[in-house]
């Protein structure tokens, strides 16, 4: 059980207040984290509260401002990047968001040696992506879908690609589907370790069907937004990888990296690129049917100026029970010999663990093992491997950082974080300096988050970087809900849940229950993290019990649970939410006439199907930006879990798993359907089709659209959304306003 430490004495209760919706919407109780911007083994940059860019040297204890807030303000900079030779800084302004990761901006180069902005050969605007080389001060940038190179900031740009075209050919940046579902970055170019070569992807979207939607704006006529967006079964982008010598880019030009024959024989994806040395690169490819992944190690052949990817350096990863990898196929972390690597994949028992691959995957040496999962490899040094896992005390929703000594035999394992601040901190991530000389730990909870700096050799804490004192003080007179994380054992399935209980919770009383669900494949909702959010308010002020349940399809508990939903989305995720609700009712403190469910995105899909399950368990529910049919969602994501919507593959389940097919079943529930009209991700089409089916079935429901809002429903829409949902739930639960 994880209980928030109680600071409440009865005599103080009258000074305590419940959370208000206003607190949540104003972000009154938001927390800060501190991630050092490492620039060497012992130095990092950080933007101070007054917006100066400060360089800290851990070993000397000295700090100095390398860039003043005055310089930042002179170009309205919101971000910066120091060149590795420390001669220049790029300043980023005019940020303009595109999709989840992508944005355009204006860039200015500031010369630290003379304290002036670089004049002459200024960068064009707006730029889609810009980065320094890892050594020196070369610049690569993407402008109008083409890649440019500068040897020095004041030099003229060298144009690397010429075929870039809006919505057609993307060089060095991903198209929509690669950005959202494969790379999870705004860039698709990678410098080699010393900046000798630049690798980049070219995405050809020429044949991809386009999603078009209206953007209403303020003009007399709405604009039409067009995005090449492959839905399940549609034509996909064609990807090619090129590498160019950045010292002499003109002599040979970009050289294409060959695709492994077993991948190239049918539709495929490129999934990631990892440089090993300046003359060795590792590419990962994936078949369109995403259960086969190939890792290909390629070497530069100087005599032919080409990249050679011998079959002997191809490593195949295949899943027989589901798809390859977790959410994504894991990426390798190479060791110092520049050929062997560490990688997370399923062991023979179906748990994702770290393996060491020296020659073939078949001969891989398993580094971690157990009925838990290794989640991320942070760093490999000459003698240590740092990783995170959920091993400690068998709580899947925790994250601790471990160190394995790889220099000694047998390798010894040490949990770096398990006992540091055990009550406060059970969910960590880490950020390492060069050679792991130092590292920062960022603890996300369950207590108030705290960021600390540590010695990479001894693991000793050096200093606290951020402890959120102001937040701690602000929460002193707030009646926070209690939280507990427990598990249900049902038919050989373990269902972990988090329950958020009103501050004066009394097991002998009856409370309305709200289920918050996401439930997407390889997701995890039950995590030991701190949050003061909308559901905290609903428990604190409105006296609701809120529960989050990780059912089949969720992550970090082994492949049996994860791959249970393979090829049949929308079945077990819903069943497990329903099963959990029945168990909660059995606990005796739930008012079974007042149970609701809500979710966003995949959670909107699950909440809709749960409401339409015909169980009679739910009085009402909310779906925000739900998927309604897998035929409407992106190919890369959907086909990973569902296969293709073709007769000879999985069309039948595509049809059976729609929300529309269950329209009749909404008759006996109160349903609130919400969607942004400019949702580039889960298209408004999804909710439009639900609404049409409900109207055709003559089923009453409530709906709210948010004009020109995307999948995130941000800004003022957020306030309106949560206010609207609060009213809906209070009405459903007969709570007074």
């Amino acid at each position: 059980i994880v209980l928030r430490p109680s600071r409440v004495h009865n005599s103080e209760e009258n000074t305590m207040r419940a959370l208000t919706l206003k607190d949540i919407l104003n972000g009154t109780f938001s927390y800060k984290t501190f991630f050092p911007n490492w620039i060497s083994g012992q130095e990092y940059l950080h933007q101070s509260a007054d917006n100066n860019i400060v360089l800290y040297n851990i070993e000397t204890g000295q700090s100095y401002t390398i860039l003043s807030n005055r310089t930042m303000k002179s170009v309205n900079a919101s971000n910066y990047g120091l060149s590795p030779d420390r001669q220049f800084v790029y300043l980023e302004s005019d940020y303009s968001k595109l999709w989840r990761y992508s944005y355009t901006a204006t860039y200015y180069i500031y010369d630290l040696s003379n304290g002036e902005f670089v004049r002459g050969n200024e960068l064009p605007r707006p730029i889609q992506y810009l980065c320094w080389s890892p050594v020196g001060s070369k610049l690569a940038y993407v402008y109008q879908n083409n890649i440019y190179l500068k040897q020095r900031p004041g030099d003229p740009p060298f144009q690397i690609t010429f075929n870039g075209r809006e919505n057609k050919i993307f060089n060095g940046i991903p198209d929509w589907v690669y950005e959202e579902e494969m790379l999870a970055t705004k860039y698709a170019l990678w410098w080699s370790p010393n900046g000798k070569f630049l690798a980049y992807a070219e995405f050809n979207d020429t044949d991809i069907p386009v999603i078009a939607y209206s953007y209403y704006g303020d003009e007399q006529y709405p604009r039409t937004i067009n995005i090449p967006y492959p839905k399940a079964g549609a034509k996909n982008p064609v990807v090619r990888i090129f590498i160019i010598d950045t010292t002499y880019p003109a002599y040979v030009g970009p050289q294409e990296v060959p695709v492994p024959a077993m991948i190239a024989s049918s539709d495929y994806y490129f999934s990631w690129l990892t440089w090993v040395t300046d003359e060795r690169v590792c590419l990962q490819w994936l078949k369109r049917v995403q259960n086969v992944s190939v890792l290909s190690i390629c070497d530069f052949r100087e005599d032919w100026q080409t990249w050679d990817c011998p079959k002997t350096q191809e490593h195949i990863e295949e899943s027989r029970t589901g798809w390859a990898g977790g959410f994504f196929v894991s990426t390798p972390v190479f060791s110092y010999d520049a050929i062997s690597y560490y990688k997370i994949f399923s062991d023979k028992d179906g748990y994702k663990h770290i393996h060491y691959i020296k020659d073939t995957v078949e001969n891989a040496i398993q580094i971690t093992s157990g009925k838990w999962e290794a989640i991320n490899i942070f760093r490999v040094t000459q003698d240590s491997l740092f990783y995170s896992s959920n091993e400690f005390e068998e709580y899947p929703g925790r994250r601790n950082i471990y160190r394995i000594s790889i220099g000694s035999y047998p390798p010894s394992k040490k949990c770096v974080t398990c006992h540091l601040r055990k009550e406060r901190c059970q969910y960590y991530t880490a950020s390492f300096s060069d050679y792991a000389k130092y590292y920062a730990l960022v603890c996300y909870g369950p207590g108030i988050p705290i960021s600390t700096l540590h010695d990479g050799r001894t693991d000793q804490e050096i200093k606290i970087l951020e402890e959120n004192k102001e937040l701690e003080n602000a929460l002193k007179n707030i009646q926070l809900p209690k939280e507990e994380i427990k598990k249900l054992e049902v038919d050989e399935i373990t269902l972990w849940y988090k329950m958020i209980l009103p501050p004066q919770f009394d097991r002998s009383k009856k409370y309305p229950l709200l289920i918050q669900v996401y439930g997407g494949p390889c997701s995890q909702s039950v995590r030991s993290v701190f949050a003061v959010n909308w559901i905290s308010y609903l428990a604190s002020k409105e006296g609701m019990v809120i529960a989050l349940v990780d059912g089949r399809g969720t992550a970090f508990q082994g492949d049996k649970l994860l791959y249970a939903v393979y090829r049949k989305l929308g079945v077990y995720e819903v069943e497990d939410q329903i099963t959990a609700v029945r168990k909660f009712i059995e606990m005796g403190f739930i008012d079974e006439k007042r149970i609701a469910i809500w979710g966003w995105s995949y959670g909107g899909y699950v909440s809709s199907l749960a409401l339409a399950s015909g169980t009679g368990l739910f009085k009402c529910g909310i779906a925000v930006a739900p998927v309604s049919s897998w035929e409407y969602y992106a190919s890369v994501y959907t086909e990973r879990f569902m296969g293709l919507p073709t007769k000879d593959d999985n069309l039948e389940h595509y049809k059976n798993s729609t929300v529309m097919a269950r329209a009749e079943y909404f008759r006996n529930v109160d349903y609130l359907l919400i969607h942004g009209t400019a949702d580039d991700n889960v298209h408004f089409q999804n909710s439009a089709q639900i609404a049409k089916a409900l109207v055709n079935a003559q089923v009453d429901f409530q709906a709210m659209w948010y004009s020109d809002q995307n999948h995130g429903l941000s800004g003022l829409s957020t306030n309106h959304l949560y206010t609207h949902m609060t009213h809906f739930l209070k009405q459903c639960f007969s709570l007074s306003d």
Epitope: N121, K150, Q151, R152, D155, P156, P157, F158, Q159, F162, K196, D245, T247, Y248, A250, Y251, D278, E302
Partner: antibody, heavy 120, light 103 residues
């Protein structure tokens, strides 16, 4: 001041080999990319080969690829061009040239040239 | 491969004249274009780099302009010592040369 001095030219029969040298002084040799450029009698300039400051990058004109090899010895401040399988159309004055700086592809300093004559 | 085409291949002008030589690239090369002067029996000499940057010691009557595919070398007031062959160059490619004679 910067000085580049080519040597090793002469008359050679077709199919034979020759090695040109270029001795550099007056600048930090190991910091600059170096090129060979040739000029056939009465003709224009033709770029032959380049080598980066540390020797890790080498490129050749198509006309000499597989026959000529560019190299450098930074400890001796010397650039080399090994020419094998020489042909009559390789007859030219060979210049070594230093980049103004890496990345702009301009040749700021040139040697005086050495004549290579390929003749039976 | 990028081709550079110079025009004219030769020209004759009088002292004091303004002279222009053009260089056209087969595809866009930003402003990575250099101009050289070569006198008989001598090594080439860099006049202008990056399309318009005059090298130190080069008389100010020489100027360069252009970007993309079309570039120009101009001599504002021709002097007797400007008689030479002029080459444009982009990395490993030279133009065929323009021979300038003084009338």
């Amino acid at each position: 001041q910067v000085q580049l001095l080519e040597s090793g030219g002469g008359v050679v029969q077709p199919g034979r080999s020759l090695r040109l040298s270029c001795a550099a002084s007056g600048f930090t040799f190991s910091s600059y990319g170096m090129h060979w450029v040739r000029q056939a009698p009465g003709k224009g300039l033709e770029w032959v080969a380049v080598i980066s400051y540390d020797g890790s990058n080498k490129y050749y004109a198509d006309s000499v690829k597989g026959r000529f090899t560019i190299s450098r010895d930074n400890s001796k401040n010397t650039l080399y061009l090994q020419m094998n399988s020489l042909r009559a159309d390789d007859t030219a004055v060979y210049y070594c040239a230093r980049e103004s700086y890496t990345g702009l592809g301009s040749f700021l300093h040139w040697g005086q040239g050495t004549l290579v004559t390929v003749s039976a | 491969n990028i081709q550079l085409t110079q025009s004219p291949s030769s020209l004759s002008a009088s002292v004091g004249d303004r002279v222009t030589i053009t260089c056209r690239a087969s595809q866009t090369i930003s402003n990575y274009l250099n101009w050289y002067q070569q006198k008989p029996g001598k090594a080439p000499k860099l006049l202008i780099s990056a399309a318009s940057s005059l090298q130190g010691g080069v008389p100010s009557r020489f100027s360069g302009s252009g970007s993309g595919t079309d570039f120009t070398l101009a001599i504002s007031s021709l002097q007797p010592e400007d008689s030479a062959t002029y080459y444009c160059q982009y990395w490993g490619t030279f133009g065929q040369g323009t021979k300038l004679e003084i009338k």
